[in-house]
């Protein structure tokens, strides 16, 4: 950056090189060039010469003043016009930054995705700071008082093998940057209470012709958790409102859920599960599309595939969709 140049003088910023966005700031330039009494001192921001708000303080020093500075980053340098010198002489340069102190981190959430071997902790960092902001995640055992700290710039994955202080912990997040430091409330967790079962996936659908046609949705999960509660939501693609069905599920076999749907309509399905009685849900599964037949029986399956409708009696395809849903982050 500009801070690496060889200087023939000094440039400094008041109140500081990193300051709160919207502040009034002063940039000072002091020349120390051999055999040069500067005729004029010039300031450049991002390579463009500044023309206003420059005050000469004395023979070697000038000040550039900015009101309500709003740029997150700028490269400043200053030059001198020396007698008998054809070009301006570089004095020095500095990178400056403006931003905000961190907000108090809130909505601290820690979950263990089954089979991941990690505890994943996330939080709401608040408003954008524009400057380098680091987060320290504190994990303190309620049983041994031992505390681990993890430095990160966003979320954190903590190996469950490193959590050797029992099952109960406090977790909190400290946010810090050049303009301030804040700390979240403490979240109390029990490792057994924050496990999210292995993802539930809708594999196929079929509509069976009967007196009243019914659609069967086939879905499964690789979870080893015994007591699992699930929700399946569905709607016509033209609708805004979801219908939700609840299930207490045992995943020793593929689940089959029955729906009585309107004919000749394209529906979308999603499923999510949680360990029964626990706090956190899986994110909703990928969108799974199924179009009910007009009257003829059809076997169909579609998760974000292109339409493959035949004029024949049956249309069959395997669910391959892995596009994330509109509610991917909904774990609470």
């Amino acid at each position: 950056g500009i801070t690496n140049i060889n200087c023939s003088g000094h440039i400094w910023v008041e109140p500081a090189t990193i300051f709160k966005m919207g502040m009034n700031i002063s940039i000072y330039c002091q020349a120390a060039i051999k055999n040069c009494q500067p005729r004029k001192l010039h300031f450049y921001k991002n390579g463009i010469k500044e023309r206003f708000q420059i005050t000469r303080i004395n023979k070697t020093t000038a000040r550039l003043w900015y009101k309500n500075f709003l740029e997150p980053h700028a490269s400043m340098y200053c030059t001198a016009e020396c007698p008998k010198h054809f070009q301006e002489t570089l004095i020095c340069g500095k990178d400056i930054s403006s931003g905000y102190p961190p907000d108090i981190p809130d909505e601290v959430t820690c979950v263990i995705y089954e089979y991941s071997g990690n505890m994943t902790c996330t939080w709401n960092a608040g408003k954008l700071t524009y400057i380098d902001t680091k987060y320290v995640v504190h994990v303190k055992s309620l049983e041994t008082e031992e505390e681990q700290q993890y430095l990160t710039s966003s979320y954190i994955n903590i190996s469950t093998d490193s959590l050797q202080g029992g099952k109960k912990y406090l977790v909190w997040v400290q946010a810090a940057n050049a303009l301030g430091m804040e700390e979240s409330k403490q979240l109390q967790i029990h490792l057994d209470d924050i496990v999210i079962p292995s993802a539930a996936v809708i594999s196929r659908a079929e509509t069976i012709n009967a007196t009243v046609p019914k659609t069967i949705i086939y879905w499964d999960s690789q979870t080893t958790i015994e007591k699992v509660s699930c929700e399946m939501r569905y709607k016509a693609t033209t609708n805004q409102t979801w219908n939700v069905k609840e299930f207490d599920t045992n995943f020793t076999y593929v689940q089959q859920s029955e729906f009585y749907l309107e004919p000749n309509i394209k529906y979308v399905f999603q499923v999510r599960c949680q360990e029964t009685g626990k706090r956190y849900w899986q994110p909703w599964s990928s969108l799974f599309f199924h179009k009910t037949p007009e009257t003829v029986p059809q076997v169909t399956s579609k998760a974000f595939q292109h339409d493959t409708w035949n004029s024949g009696l049956t249309v069959a395809s395997i669910s391959t969709g892995h596009l994330t849903s509109d509610n991917r982050g909904d774990i609470g």
Epitope: E145, L170, M181, E183
Partner: antibody, heavy 121, light 112 residues
């Protein structure tokens, strides 16, 4: 068994700075630990000054009153922690202790012998 | 800012007496509380940690109880060597930017 050995007594002028050292033996420097500093003015109670956390990264924490005046550092190569207090005034006359449990808990099983710092003009 | 309020500030008792000292935190500190004994000219000595766990080498006449905000140190039968000043200390977290002191103000136990 952790042992903490502090530097000797100091007499300082108001406005100057003092740096007290605390050499630790018996701490596993590969593990996470807190090293903290506590002071006690003559006839007064214990006053927490701050701590340094040493682990995969280093973090320092200071009492509200100590911010800007106290700097705590650790030199892992010599197993020594330091506490520097600047802008000394007469009310900083106290015995200064380093304290730790040799791990990442905040209660203190082990204390240094104390360093008397006298601030006088 | 978590504040630690210790009471009484001093008490007089006789050998064999049961002595109780209380410490109150201004917010929930779970069981993260320690008790220390200090004698004149000496560094403090850890008696109790995690509110109720006895530190190594501490006689069983010392006990601690409480969680959340209210804590108690009890000496079941005061011995001559127990005349000293006792301090509580919150050991929950020191990362909070607004902490002033983590110790209580102290309780001086003197001979009646």
């Amino acid at each position: 068994q952790v042992q903490l050995v502090q530097s000797g007594a100091e007499v300082k002028k108001p406005g100057s700075s003092v740096k007290v050292s605390c050499k630790a033996s018996g701490i596993d420097f590969n593990s996470n630990y807190y090293m903290c500093w506590v002071r006690q003015a003559p006839g007064q109670g214990l006053e927490w000054m701050g701590c340094i956390y040493v682990g995969s990264h280093v973090n320092t924490y200071y009492a509200n009153w100590a911010k800007g005046r106290v700097t705590i550092t650790a030199d892992e190569s010599t197993s020594t922690a330091y506490m520097e207090l600047s802008s000394l005034r007469s009310e900083d006359t106290a015995v200064y202790y380093c304290a730790t449990s040799g791990s990442s808990v905040l209660y203190f099983k082990f204390w240094g012998q104390g360093t008397l710092v006298t601030v006088s003009s | 800012d978590i504040q630690m309020t210790q009471s009484p500030s001093s008490l007089s008792a006789s050998v064999g007496d049961r002595v109780t000292i209380t410490c109150q935190a201004s917010e929930n500190i779970y069981s993260f509380l320690a008790w220390y004994q200090q004698k004149p000219g000496k560094a403090p000595k850890l008696l109790i940690y995690s509110a109720s766990k006895l530190a190594a080498g501490v006689p069983s006449r010392f006990s601690g109880s409480g969680s959340g905000t209210d804590f108690t140190l009890t000496i079941s039968s005061l011995q001559p060597e127990d005349f000293a000043t006792y301090y509580c200390q919150q050991t929950n977290r020191y990362s909070n930017p607004d902490i002033y002191n983590v110790f209580g103000t102290g309780t001086k136990v003197t001979v009646l």
